[in-house]
Interface confidence: low
Amino acid sequence: YDFTNCDFEKIKAAYLSTISKDLITYMSGTKSTEFNNTVSCSNRPHCLTEIQSLTFNPTAGCASLAKEMFAMKTKAALAIWCPGYSETQINATQAMKKRRKRKVTTNKCLEQVSQLQGLWRRFNRPLLKQQ
């Protein structure tokens, strides 16, 4: 999906009002210095691409983020403020079999959410030069 035509200010507002708090809640009990933020993005569409990947793509060491509160709110924000985004997600959602879920929080998930926090911060400051 091409995030170029999203309403970035509305997504930023959604992040500041709720998503950021949910990310902090998920990371509660973790020192802010525990993980280095290495995942980067160069502009707002790129940031949203990376945010989508880390939030919704299944990973080998962390497989449970898509059902977290911050992930569901991220999905809602993208669906509302990115034209055509929800259509691109329908097939993927329908393809998933309905099974009983169990919540698993692993260290790899904590690292991944730490990276997500960095990507969101970068998304909110698009004019900053890359370090």
Partner: antibody, heavy 121, light 112 residues
Framework: EVQLVESGGGLVQPGGSLRLSCAAS????????MTWVRQAPGKGLEWVSS????????YYADSVKGRFTISRDNAKNSLSLQMNSLRAEDTAVYYC??????????????WGQGVLVTVSS | DIVMTQTPLSLSVTPGEPASISCRSS???????????LHWYLQKPGQSPQLLIY???HRASGVPDRFSGSGSDTDFTLKISRVEAEDVGVYYC?????????FGGGTKVEIK
């Protein structure tokens, strides 16, 4: 073009050391987990080690644990594998690969050309 | 460790004919997130392996649609609808549900 280029292979005596390097280009290296896979002559593929994008988590195959060390330098787009106490059974082509955890369910979607390590006296 | 078993060991196929490779895991590769962590690779003669299929059935970028993956839990299949000369090589399945990640022993596909 997305590319991984390995270097540092060669002939080494049993008990010796070798350091493999992998130079990444064409993608944002720091956004991906990286993995080393090896293939002994005429044999199949064997997973060796993986490192997460921020180096927070590192995994090794039992066969190399305590002898091999994986590391990365995101500023230089490089991955390394320090191999100590080498044995004859470590003789293989070593592949640097992208993946092992971050995207596409951990599948390895980019592979280097491989570098041959021969352990022999 | 999860053991991956591939059959057959080798396969000789006439161009244009279909081919099928089986991969069986010693335990289910289905995670509670509903994804199944099984991937397929092809190693052509003298080349590095390349990703064909990820997460059971998703074709990697640039992979022809004659390749398809299917299966669930512990039993998986890679199908080539019409084998072409360029499809020769060794096919491997891999699980990334848990470390150590493990590969199948490989299936060598030749052209008759």
């Amino acid at each position: 073009e997305v590319q991984l280029v390995e270097s540092g292979g060669g002939l080494v005596q049993p008990g010796g050391s070798l350091r493999l390097s992998c130079a990444a280009s064409g993608f944002t290296f720091s956004n991906y987990d990286m993995t080393w896979v090896r293939q002994a002559p005429g044999k199949g593929l064997e997973w060796v080690s993986s490192i997460t994008f921020a180096s927070s988590y590192i995994y090794y195959a039992d066969s190399v644990k305590g002898r091999f060390t994986i590391s990365r330098d995101n500023a230089k787009n490089s991955l390394s594998l320090q191999m100590n106490s080498l044995r004859a059974e470590d003789t293989a082509v070593y592949y640097c690969t992208r993946g092992g955890g971050a995207y596409y369910g951990g599948s390895l979607d980019v592979w280097g050309q491989g570098v041959l390590v021969t352990v022999s006296s | 460790d999860i053991v991956m078993t591939q059959t057959p060991l080798s396969l000789s196929v006439t161009p244009g004919e279909p081919a099928s490779i089986s991969c069986r895991s010693s335990q289910s590769l289905l995670h509670s997130n509903e994804y199944t962590y099984l991937h397929w690779y092809l190693q052509k003669p003298g080349q590095s392996p390349q990703l064909l299929i990820y997460l059971v059935s998703h074709r990697a970028s640039g992979v022809p649609d004659r390749f398809s993956g299917s299966g669930s839990d512990t039993d998986f299949t890679l199908k080539i609808s019409r084998v072409e000369a360029e499809d020769v090589g060794v096919y491997y399945c891999e699980q990334t549900l848990q470390t150590p990640f493990t590969f199948g022993g490989g299936t060598k596909v030749e052209i008759k």
